[in-house]
């Protein structure tokens, strides 16, 4: 279930997945929530003088049992991911951090009158993930009232330092506040030849688009369908970027589908989850557990309730069916996507809905309205 | 709600509190906004108090303590209790409330989607019940709206648990075999909602149960899809265009 409590002066021992820098425990928790395997985190708000490089360290952790041994550590804050917390799941982070320099690759320096303008500038720039603003009292005159737009490979700062008269924060694209606009176009039989930042295996272009939307550096994508000639690239979703922020003109390519990240959308941003169940499709991955249930949707629900489960397979083979139902195989992988997708199985596959929000569109099929 | 947790503001924006104002004002039942001028609830909420004038309806709230004399409330223009509902039997436990003035939809107050008649056999897996009712059988009304996720129980299985009552196709049951999570007193009339195809639907209206959250005693809800003809007939015959199909 959902566990929101934070443990002060507590550090989880072991289970390390990744370490990043975040300005506070809340942002660390958010990063853990969106990491495919992270269940627990420990954040170092205060460190001894010898370990200043560990201050603001966010240590993302996993555990087979869902818990890890706790050790006392002054200045540490630990907690759980919010993967099963429905309504509380949001990539949006509006907090501003006074006296912090969130470091990264500075790709633009502009003069702005205030922090709000600087944050808006970041929100309206394709590449900007976070920013630092130097106030008029900053010790170096040439940087005063300057807004530094930044990015990094992980989307989080490469380090964080305390510094007087600097203020830092994050882009508000994930709060649906960007004014860039979002092209919804899907280009059938087209590929973008731009820089690949990552690749994952997905069952369709829509899942590919959602993954691109929530990837820190993906601006557009190309997905190769199951009919693609190169076997090793079938069902592969290439996450892409470019210096300009726009893709080069699409190249005609049979069995390729391309499109844009929806990060800069204001209304049509997808949820960070995929609810569709794919019939006749086998999602391969590491097996977590096997249960017997009645129906693929119950299998999906079981996967959703099992916090480590990322995707599932529901088999309808007679030998996989008992009186209490058919085989529901709960699975996971390092990146949250299947390691391979094959077709023609007797059954269906789908994803966990653990990152789905509980809010919804008001578009009903049947409506009661006053004339 | 037994075994639930606090809801967040705007999480269940269709939930309303039905309150009776006699000497003092008390929360008695829940209800669901289904249109600007319409709330769907349980007929049994009005047993002994079928007088529209004494009811006050509050939407867009999370805590009952938010309600003061200044809090705007809706009044009942017309109370439509299902014509087949008999106090002595408890079937057809459904009622429509037409409000005197249309509601303004906000982030915190908006309607829930209704199922279609065709949804009568839909299998729902992600269902929640909400309300300000008791958190135990001998409890008290809660200040903060509670929510709980609860699995649906097939009618045949539900019938075995309630051999003294007829669990008919106009009812739908929900609960865990081991108990522990359920609606309770004060949650009546409120929603049982399920997320289906990415959309929340009003699947049930909290109706009754043997005690609250007892082992092998699921909650019983009025099955909304079975009453769609009635809902549409009543809302249309009351000078309202009811059916609107969206390109969802």
């Amino acid at each position: 279930g959902c566990m929101t409590q934070l443990y002060k002066n507590t550090f989880f021992r072991g289970g390390d997945l990744a370490a990043i820098y975040t300005p506070d425990a809340q942002y660390c928790q958010k990063m853990c929530t969106f990491h495919p395997r992270c269940l627990l985190f420990s954040f170092l708000a205060v460190t001894p003088p010898k370990e200043t490089n560990k201050r603001f360290g966010c240590f993302m952790k996993e555990s087979i049992t869902g818990t890890l041994p706790r050790i006392h550590r002054t200045g540490a804050i630990s907690g759980h991911s919010l993967k099963q917390c429905g309504h509380q799941i949001s990539a949006c982070h509006r907090d501003i951090y006074k006296g912090l320099d969130m470091r990264g690759s500075n790709f633009n320096i502009s003069k702005t009158d205030n922090i709000e303008e600087c944050q808006k500038l970041c929100t309206n720039n394709f590449h900007c993930q976070f920013f630092t603003y130097a106030t008029s009292a900053f010790y170096r005159p040439e940087y005063r009232k300057k807004c530094l737009l930044k990015h990094s490979a992980s989307g989080t700062p490469t380090s964080i330092k305390s510094a007087d008269n600097l203020v830092s924060g994050f882009s508000l694209k994930s709060c649906a506040l960007s004014e860039i606009g979002c092209p919804m176009d899907i280009f059938q039989h087209s590929a973008f030849a731009d820089l690949n930042v990552s690749q994952v295996i997905t069952p369709d272009a829509f899942v590919c688009r959602t993954i691109c939307t929530f990837h820190p550096n993906c601006l557009f994508f190309t997905f190769y369908t199951n009919e693609w000639e190169t076997e090793s690239q079938r069902n592969v979703c290439f996450l892409k970027t470019s210096k300009s922020g726009r893709p080069s003109p699409p190249i005609p390519q049979e069995n390729a589908i391309s499109g844009y990240s929806l990060l800069t959308c204001r209304k049509t941003r997808p949820e960070p989850c995929h609810s569709k169940i794919y019939s006749g499709v086998d999602f391969e991955g590491e097996e977590l557990n096997v249960t017997f249930v009645q129906g693929a949707d119950v299998c999906q629900e079981t996967c959703t309730k099992t916090i480590r489960c990322q995707f599932f397979i529901y088999s309808l083979l007679p030998q996989d069916c008992k009186e209490e139902g058919c085989k529901c195989s709960l699975r996971l992988s390092t990146d949250g996507s299947p390691t391979r997708i094959t077709y023609g199985m007797q059954g269906s596959s789908g994803y966990s809905l653990r990152l789905c929000k509980l809010v919804d569109s008001p578009d009903c099929t049947t409506k009661i309205n006053a004339r | 709600i037994v075994g639930g947790t606090n809801a967040s503001l705007g999480e269940w924006p269709w939930q309303v509190s039905l309150q009776v104002k006699l000497v003092s004002q008390t929360h008695l039942c829940g209800g669901s906004i289904i249109g600007r001028q319409w709330v769907l609830t349980a007929a049994h909420c009005f047993d002994g108090i079928p007088y529209p004038d004494v009811w006050r309806i509050y939407g867009g709230i999370l805590s009952l303590s938010e309600i003061t004399k200044e809090t705007p409330s809706s009044r009942i223009k017309e109370l439509i209790i299902h014509q087949e509902y008999k106090v002595s039997e408890g079937n057809y436990d459904i009622a429509l409330i037409k409000l005197q003035t249309p509601l303004n939809y906000t982030e915190f107050q908006k309607p829930i989607c209704l199922p279609s008649k065709a949804d009568t056999n839909t299998i729902y897996t992600n269902c929640w019940v909400t309300g300000w009712g008791y958190t135990k059988e001998q409890g008290e009304t809660q200040n903060i709206l509670q929510k709980a996720t609860i699995p649906l129980v097939p009618n045949e299985e539900c019938q075995k648990k309630y051999r003294d009552y007829v669990i008919n196709k106009q009812m739908i049951c929900a609960g865990y075999k081991e108990g522990g999570t359920d609606a309770c007193k004060g949650d009546s009339g409120g929603p049982l909602v399920c997320k289906h195809s990415g959309r929340w639907q009003l699947v049930g209206i909290t109706s009754w149960g043997e005690g609250c959250a007892r082992k092998d005693q699921p909650g019983v809800y009025t099955k909304v899809s079975e009453y769609m003809d009635w809902i549409l007939e009543k809302t249309q015959s009351s000078d309202v265009r009811a059916l609107e199909t969206s390109s969802a």
Epitope: - | A42, D47, E89, G133, R163, D164, Y165, K185, E210
Partner: antibody, heavy 125, light 107 residues
Framework: EVQLLESGGGLVQPGGSLRLSCAAS????????MTWVRQAPGKGLEWVSY????????IYADSVKGRFTISRDNSKNTLYLQMNSLRAEDTAVYYC??????????????????WGQGTLVTVSS | DIQMTQSPSFLSASVGDRVTITCRAS??????LAWYQQKPGKAPKLLIY???TLQSGVPSRFSGSGSGTEFTLTISSLQPEDFATYYC?????????FGGGTKVEIK
């Protein structure tokens, strides 16, 4: 209008038998639980027995168990109470009543919403 | 068996008086309680069920409250037709049991 009319009461010797009937009208008899309640002269009310709508389930008070049998004929809209091995302490006015099972405060709740006028049974030698 | 204890057994009151009758259960019965009124030579009449729900057609001067083991029947302003005997009944578990009755007489 709901009506319940008892008959079959009278004077009977200890150890004797009597069969009470209750004719129901004005409602769908087969939908309802039915019950018998008795009241000894100058005393309070005592519940005797109940029967489910189909007649498949019956329950009795300890004081009459093994001696009284409740039954019903839904085709005739009639409830019966067969009383055997009668004792002096069985002397009472016997009422049949309809058991309503509505919903209140989210619970199913039973109550006796309509009663017959009663029939007097006197057990005396 | 659940014992139902009613008090007082007798009550003398005048027209217009506020009258309260108490019923105590020997163990918790939730809200599974009904109140009946009986006049001499007549069958009992249902007033209140589920501890507090007024039966249709019963005047609103009658009200019920309580839950668990303590219950009350209140007549806010006694009318001439209210002089009768009142019984509480638990419907929580078999055998169903009645209280001993409260006779409300004219003072």
């Amino acid at each position: 209008e709901v009506q319940l009319l008892e008959s079959g009461g009278g004077l009977v010797q200890p150890g004797g038998s009597l069969r009470l009937s209750c004719a129901a009208s004005g409602f769908t008899f087969s939908h309802y639980l039915m019950t018998w309640v008795r009241q000894a002269p100058g005393k309070g009310l005592e519940w005797v027995s109940y029967i489910s709508p189909s007649g498949g389930h019956t329950i009795y008070a300890d004081s009459v168990k093994g001696r009284f049998t409740i039954s019903r004929d839904n085709s005739k809209n009639t409830l019966y109470l067969q009383m055997n091995s009668l004792r002096a302490e069985d002397t009472a006015v016997y009422y049949c009543a309809r058991v309503a099972r509505g919903i209140a405060a989210r619970s199913r709740t039973s109550y006796f919403d309509y009663w017959g006028q009663g029939t007097l049974v006197t057990v005396s030698s | 068996d659940i014992q139902m204890t009613q008090s007082p057994s007798f009550l003398s009151a005048s027209v217009g008086d506020r009258v309260t009758i108490t019923c105590r259960a020997s163990q918790g019965i939730s809200s599974y309680l009904a109140w009946y009124q009986q006049k001499p030579g007549k069958a009992p009449k249902l007033l209140i069920y589920a501890a507090s729900t007024l039966q249709s057609g019963v005047p609103s001067r009658f009200s019920g409250s309580g839950s668990g083991t303590e219950f009350t029947l209140t007549i806010s302003s006694l009318q001439p037709e209210d002089f009768a005997t009142y019984y509480c009944q638990q419907l929580n578990s078999y055998p169903l049991t009645f209280g001993g009755g409260t006779k409300v007489e004219i003072k």
